[in-house]
């Protein structure tokens, strides 16, 4: 025979073809072998011109031989070489599908691989590719879009060889709150790490606000609106600064009275105050908390105390906010001026969390009277808020 070629090569099959011998022959003897693969020999009829090779090993170079037989006579042997394809990974599956994450798992191919190419594409045409190592059989997809159809494909790699792609289709779950109006809604969307988040006042995407969310204290979901921790930020600021907010949300900061008014106008909120000093901790929770608008000079409502710090905020309930340049307190003197801070002063304070950091002079420092009195400036303080019905929302989400 002559003109031995292989066609239709896959990872486990190939088709051998040849030109028949000019003379009539009884049979053809076909043999094929590969590295680490024992030789297989087959005899076929003399009028056959092709033979399907099956049960081949993937990604293997085979040597194929064929000769003709007529009675006791044998023709010369002709030879061809071919390499089987790399077989594909198997059983690609998307599990643990959330609004922005999913876990892809697969079974490895039979052939050894040098890695895998993962491609995932959303219906809007956004394509991402990632190459993972040869021992990997799962990959966590992140930063997906909620409520979106995705096609995920995987291909095995072995040097220059690439397997066929296999694919799976999945749909991310919709966010409970596409435009979370506070940290509790961000948490109910599945975000459980404390840090910076964007919230949308009244769920309006045009009213974006970057906030620090405390996702750990007492179940999480808190918007932190004040933090004192090291004295690097100046809190002896004017009315305009306290209305707008100032500082670094990751460090010491004040979120702003206008923002507090807008947030607490969204529903019923609770206040939590966390205090820390030389290894001691205390907290206060008030189940009703709101801040009025600029017309009321950001009047404070705080009721329903529980906790370990003592009820020092009650003294300030119903008071307007005061700064050194806008004196709204009930004292003849200017409390903000006298105590170098700003607060919902009365005459003057039980709480002075915006006082002078580290100042242990009477009433000048970061004070919470019923915990450390007025002659001890507290090292760490945070004020934070979340919806009063957060526990109910959280329970509903868990049941869902």
């Amino acid at each position: 025979p002559s003109g031995l070629v292989t066609a239709n090569i896959t990872d486990s099959e190939a088709l051998a073809r040849w030109q028949p011998a000019i003379a009539t022959v009884d049979s053809y003897v076909i043999s094929y072998t590969g590295e680490k693969v024992p030789e297989i020999t087959r005899t076929v009829s003399g009028n056959t011109v092709e033979y399907a090779l099956t049960d081949l090993e993937p990604a293997t170079e085979y040597t194929l031989r064929i000769f003709a037989e007529k009675g006791p006579q044998k023709s010369s042997t002709i030879t061809a070489k071919f390499t089987t394809d790399l077989d594909s990974p198997r059983d690609l599956t998307a599990t643990e599908v959330q609004s922005e994450t999913a876990l892809l798992t697969w079974r490895p191919p039979r052939a050894s691989v040098t890695g895998y190419l993962l491609v995932y594409e959303s219906v809007d045409g956004t394509v991402k590719e990632v190459i993972v190592g040869p021992d990997t059989t799962s990959y966590s997809l992140a930063d997906l879009s909620p409520s979106t159809h995705y096609t995920a494909k995987i291909q095995a790699l072995n040097g220059p060889l690439r397997s066929n792609m296999i694919q799976t289709i999945f749909t991310t779950i919709g966010l409970l709150y596409p435009f979370p109006k506070d940290c509790s809604q961000a948490m109910l969307n599945g975000d459980t790490t404390s840090g910076l988040y964007t919230i949308y006042l009244n769920g309006d995407k045009a009213e974006a606000l970057e906030v620090f969310c405390d996702m750990t204290s007492d179940g999480g979901g808190w918007i932190v609106f004040l933090r004192r921790k090291n004295g690097r930020e100046n809190f002896y600021q004017n009315w305009k600064a306290y209305a707008a907010g100032f500082g670094d949300r990751r460090e010491e900061f004040w979120l702003g009275l206008d923002n507090l008014n807008k947030i607490t106008a969204q529903g019923q909120y609770e206040l939590r105050v966390d205090l820390r000093d030389h290894g001691e901790t205390a907290f206060a929770v008030y189940d009703k908390f709101s801040v009025g608008d600029a017309k009321t000079r950001y009047k404070l409502k705080v009721e329903g105390y529980s906790g370990t710090a003592g009820d020092s905020m009650a003294y300030h309930n119903g008071r307007s906010f005061s700064t050194f340049d806008k004196d709204t307190d009930s004292a003849i003197t200017n409390c903000a001026l006298s105590y170098k801070g700003a607060f919902w002063y009365r005459n003057c304070h039980r709480v002075n969390l915006m006082g002078r950091y580290g100042d242990n002079n009477h009433s000048q420092g970061v004070n919470w009277f019923h915990w450390k009195g007025h002659e001890h400036s507290i090292q760490f303080a945070e004020m934070k808020l979340r919806p009063s019905n957060f526990r109910n929302l959280e329970g509903r989400r868990k049941r869902a």
Epitope: E303, Y305, D311, A314, Y315, N317, S330, A331, I332, T333, R346, N347, C348, H349, H362, S363, H374
Partner: antibody
Framework: QVQLVESGGGLVQPGRSLRLSCAAS????????MHWVRQAPGKGLEWVSG????????YYADSVKGRFTISRDNAKNSLYLQMNSLRAEDTALYYC?????????????WGQGTMVTVSS | DIQMTQSPASLPTPVGDRVTITCRAS??????LNWYQQKPGKAPKLLIY???NLETGVPSRFSGSGSGTDFTLTISSLQPEDFATYYC?????????FGQGTKVDIK
């Protein structure tokens, strides 16, 4: 309008007990802290004890600590002062007073008082 | 405990005169100071709280001032119905304490 009516005073021997009551009306009782203040005959005012609106926090003057107990029943709009181990120096007119807020702050509105006389 | 010292103990004053009563706290109390008026056989009545805030219904001739440790109650023009005993009281910390009283009587 706010009304506070004290009762339970009387003549009692030293070492004995007495329970004073204060019936409140005209305001949401559990929204306000309450106080007991006394005045010995011909003398000045002495703050005795106080209790927060919820009843969760109680406070006492050193002179009565360990002998007197303040309590309240918000369902009955009533304030109480249980006085044990009474002494002659506890003889006074006892006033109940409503605070301006839910915590120890300013005794704002006072009742007319009930007289306690400790004598053998 | 915080001691409250009032002066004078007695203040004979003619009707129409200005009256000034002072009160000193034994320690710093910000503005946590209140003034009461007591007439014979009657319960005390709150006049001023937070050192300077006039209680509802109290005539404007009464005023309070001061901060920290030193406080003053002023009656700008003494009226016949103002003859009474006046007490200062600190509400800064418990136990709350009263001054010993100042008796304003007719001169």
């Amino acid at each position: 309008q706010v009304q506070l009516v004290e009762s339970g005073g009387g003549l009692v021997q030293p070492g004995r007990s007495l329970r004073l009551s204060c019936a409140a009306s005209g305001f949401t009782f559990d929204d306000y802290a309450m106080h007991w203040v006394r005045q010995a005959p011909g003398k000045g005012l002495e703050w005795v004890s106080g209790i927060s609106g919820s009843g969760g926090s109680t406070y006492y003057a050193d002179s009565v600590k360990g002998r007197f107990t303040i309590s309240r029943d918000n369902a009955k709009n009533s304030l109480y002062l249980q006085m044990n181990s009474l002494r002659a120096e506890d003889t006074a007119l006892y006033y109940c007073a409503k605070d301006i807020s839910a915590v120890m702050d300013v005794p704002q509105t006072w009742g007319q008082g009930t007289m306690v006389t400790v004598s053998s | 405990d915080i001691q409250m010292t009032q002066s004078p103990a007695s203040l004979p004053t003619p009707v129409g005169d200005r009256v000034t009563i002072t009160c000193r706290a034994s320690q710093y109390i910000q503005g946590f100071l209140n003034w009461y008026q007591q007439k014979p056989g009657k319960a005390p009545k709150l006049l001023i709280y937070d050192a300077s805030n006039l209680e509802t219904g109290v005539p404007s001739r009464f005023s309070g001032s001061g901060s920290g440790t030193d406080f003053t109650l002023t009656i700008s023009s003494l009226q016949p119905e103002d003859f009474a005993t006046y007490y200062c009281q600190q509400s800064y910390s418990t136990p709350q304490t009263f001054g010993q009283g100042t008796k304003v009587d007719i001169k």
